[in-house]
């Protein structure tokens, strides 16, 4: 049984030309993560692997950094990365675990940060 | 090209054991989960074990548990499914697959290797 | 554990025609469906990941759809080739789960 829920930065703002940090948290659940991957829509940006540490798909090298932890940094922000970002955590025993991310990419220097919210 | 050839299946006895083989190629192996599925002689398919690529984390279906150990030698690029104390439930062709790098999906399977489990 | 349930067990087409094959999860599996395709003798073939991605080397003609409990997989217009059995697969929650297949033979 799957007991576990993801807590994300949800809804969240930056400046074009800057960075942001995308995080997600699996909670409530004793199960082990084997991998984290992170994708803009169907594209699949970088993979946390347990064993093998960090890959980032090379159309992507330039411009997104592993880290924080188990979270990715985008860099060098266009209007064109504005949308939804997921995180989706294999583990054992549980299964496959999806959070989602908005990221408004702004023109502006007002960036507000959105609050936090859980998904089940 | 990528290559998964299976071997060590065969006629055993209730209660016997086995071990099978997945020799892979054309690919870096040390960076990918493995996995055996079998596919029972009414054609349903069964993932049965599956192996991360450093060998750090395994999966075994409940009713294999304790008797079936998956396990693999990235120095060899070898697949392994030492299988004991098997059931005439177990009679099935073994499948070593591979999973793509983001772990959704199985992209490519050996031929099969059979096992019958006799009485 | 989750049970797929494919429909139909088995259907009969005429090559060009469009066939529809459906697979029903037993509960909630977001996204996580995989299809393969098995020839007779032949080790089953990847298709479709993430109900909807083409695996690579896929023919276009084939396509999926659906989230939630309710999958397809569809095949626009049917070719020699294609005449074969097909499972689902989820990938939510272990043990990941097969469906019990659907034989597409020739009308």
């Known amino acids: 049984m799957m007991t576990g829920t993801i807590e994300t930065t949800g809804n969240i703002s930056a400046e074009k030309g800057g960075s942001i940090i995308l995080q997600c948290h699996l909670s409530s659940t004793t199960a082990q993560v084997t991998q984290v991957n992170w994708e803009q829509q169907d594209q699949l940006l970088a993979i946390c692997n347990a064993d093998l540490g960090w890959h980032i798909s090379p159309s992507f090298k330039d411009r997104v950094a592993p880290g924080p932890g188990l979270g990715l940094t985008l860099q060098s922000l266009t209007v064109n990365d504005t949308g939804e970002y997921f995180c989706i955590y294999h583990t054992y025993p549980d299964g496959t675990y999806t959070g989602r991310i908005f990221l408004e990419v702004l023109e502006s220097s007002v960036a507000e940060h959105g609050a936090r919210f859980q998904i089940p | 090209d990528v290559k998964l050839v299976e071997s060590g299946g065969g006629l055993v006895k209730l209660g016997g054991s086995l071990k099978l083989s997945c020799a892979a190629s054309?690919?870096?192996?040390?960076?990918?989960?493995m996995s055996w599925v079998r596919q029972t002689p009414e054609k349903r398919l069964e993932l049965v074990a599956a192996?991360?690529?450093?060998?750090?984390?395994?999966y075994y279906l409940d009713t294999v548990k304790g008797r079936f150990t998956i396990s693999r030698d990235n120095a060899k690029n070898t697949l392994y499914l030492q299988m004991s104390s098997l059931k005439s439930e177990d009679t099935a062709l073994f499948y070593c697959?591979?999973?793509?790098?983001?772990?959704?999906?199985?992209?490519?399977w050996g031929q099969g290797t059979s096992v019958t489990v006799s009485s | 554990a989750i049970q797929m349930t494919q429909s139909p067990s088995s259907l009969s087409a005429s090559v060009g025609d469009r066939v529809t094959i459906t697979c029903q999860a037993s509960?909630?599996?977001?996204?996580?469906l995989s299809w393969y395709q098995q020839k007779p003798g032949k080790a089953p073939k990847l298709l479709i990941y993430?109900?909807?991605t083409l695996a690579s080397g896929v023919p276009s003609r084939f396509s999926g759809s659906g989230s939630g409990t309710d999958f397809t997989l569809t095949i626009s217009s049917l070719q020699p080739d294609d005449f074969a059995t097909y499972y689902c697969?989820?990938?939510?929650?272990?043990?990941?789960?097969f469906g019990g297949g659907t034989k597409v033979e020739i009308k």
């Open positions: 509960q909630n599996i977001n996204v996580w």
């Open positions: 192996i991360s690529s450093g060998g750090s984390y395994t």
């Open positions: 993430k109900a909807s």
């Open positions: 054309g690919f870096t192996f040390s960076s990918y989960t």
């Open positions: 697959t591979r999973w793509l790098l983001s772990l959704y999906a199985m992209d490519y």
């Open positions: 697969q989820q990938g939510q929650t272990y043990p990941f789960t």
